[in-house]
């Protein structure tokens, strides 16, 4: 099966790599603009230069292109705890990330929030915190994992999944509050 190509991809595929087909004259292939620049004017004819201009401050193009405008630089979302790792340049967008001992939780493909890595109190670190994943904890005896925190078995209700992990404690407890810890 031939993959479906958009009009622009169809037009570009007629020209060799690094060139694009002139929008008004499909017998002319113009050289694409380098990253950090955008298309100001198409080339007037075969073998003639494309008029490319450098992106203005606050905008960029990260690859060779024939865009009529540069792309606006992204802004890091302070309300999501994001910090700027590297600022925007004419050929690279802003890079946003999280502070040390934090990880990214992706709300959507294009949006992440920074959360503190779990410290595994009352447990041990099974897998260290990574850029896009929280620490994975293993809990000590008498504790069970809830929302990646080690919680005392005294907080385990019979209806919850913790009953398997806390079963000995629950059977010994018979309703007393302080019995879940070992």
């Amino acid at each position: 099966l031939v993959p479906h190509l958009g009009d622009r991809e169809k037009r570009d595929s007629v020209c060799p790599q690094g060139k694009y087909i002139h929008p008004q004259n499909n017998s002319i292939c113009c050289t694409k603009c380098h990253k950090g620049t955008y298309l100001y004017n198409d080339c007037p004819g075969p073998g003639q230069d494309t008029d490319c201009r450098e992106c203005e401050s606050g905008s960029f193009t990260a690859s060779e292109n024939h865009l009529r405008h540069c792309l606006s630089c992204s802004k890091c979302r302070k309300e999501m705890g994001q910090v700027e790792i590297s600022s925007c340049t004419v050929d690279r967008d802003t890079v946003c990330g999280c502070r040390k001992n934090q990880y990214r939780h992706y709300w959507s493909e294009n949006l992440f929030q920074c959360f503190n890595c779990s410290l595994c109190l009352n447990g041990t670190v099974h897998l260290s915190c990574q850029e896009k994943q929280n620490t994975v904890c293993t809990c000590h005896a008498g504790f069970f994992l809830r929302e990646n925190e080690c919680v005392s078995c005294s907080n385990c209700k019979k209806s919850l999944e913790c009953t398997k992990l806390c079963l000995p404690q629950i059977e010994n407890v018979k309703g007393t509050e302080d019995s879940g810890t070992t």
Partner: nanobody, 122 residues
Framework: EVQLLESGGGLVQPGGSLRLSCAAS????????MGWVRQAPGKGLEWVSF????????YYADSVKGRFTISRDNSKNTLYLQMNSLRAEDTAVYYC???????????????WGQGTLVTVSS
């Protein structure tokens, strides 16, 4: 077909409370992050709150922090927004939205409800 149906809006006095609900169908509710977004009259969209698929992580806009609580019941395929200490500036149409995880083409949300109007006035 994905459907998000909000309910619970209405007229409330300043300082009052409301609980919005969003019944979801047509997709595996438990597999997606969900959120509430609002649009005040003549203004742009504002993110209100998000909740992750497990109900463990939440996000709140500064304007609603400490007053609104987002929650979900995965067994009922329902998203909630408990709104307390309501103010006139909370007046808006509130939309339930599914957050997009793949092939989003720059968008944060891929499906929205029709919205429910919340009016805070004395």
């Amino acid at each position: 077909e994905v459907q998000l149906l909000e309910s619970g809006g209405g007229l409330v006095q300043p300082g009052g409370s409301l609980r919005l609900s969003c019944a979801a169908s047509g997709f595996t509710f438990v597999a997606y992050n969900m959120g509430w977004v609002r649009q005040a009259p003549g203004k742009g969209l504002e993110w209100v709150s998000f909740i992750d698929m497990y109900g463990a992580k939440t996000y709140y806009a500064d304007s609603v922090k400490g007053r609104f609580t987002i929650s979900r019941d995965n067994s009922k395929n329902t998203l909630y927004l408990q709104m307390n200490s309501l103010r006139a500036e909370d007046t808006a149409v509130y939309y339930c939205a599914k957050l997009c995880l793949m092939d989003c083409s720059g968008d944060i949300f891929d499906y929205w409800g029709q919205g429910t109007l919340v009016t805070v006035s004395s």
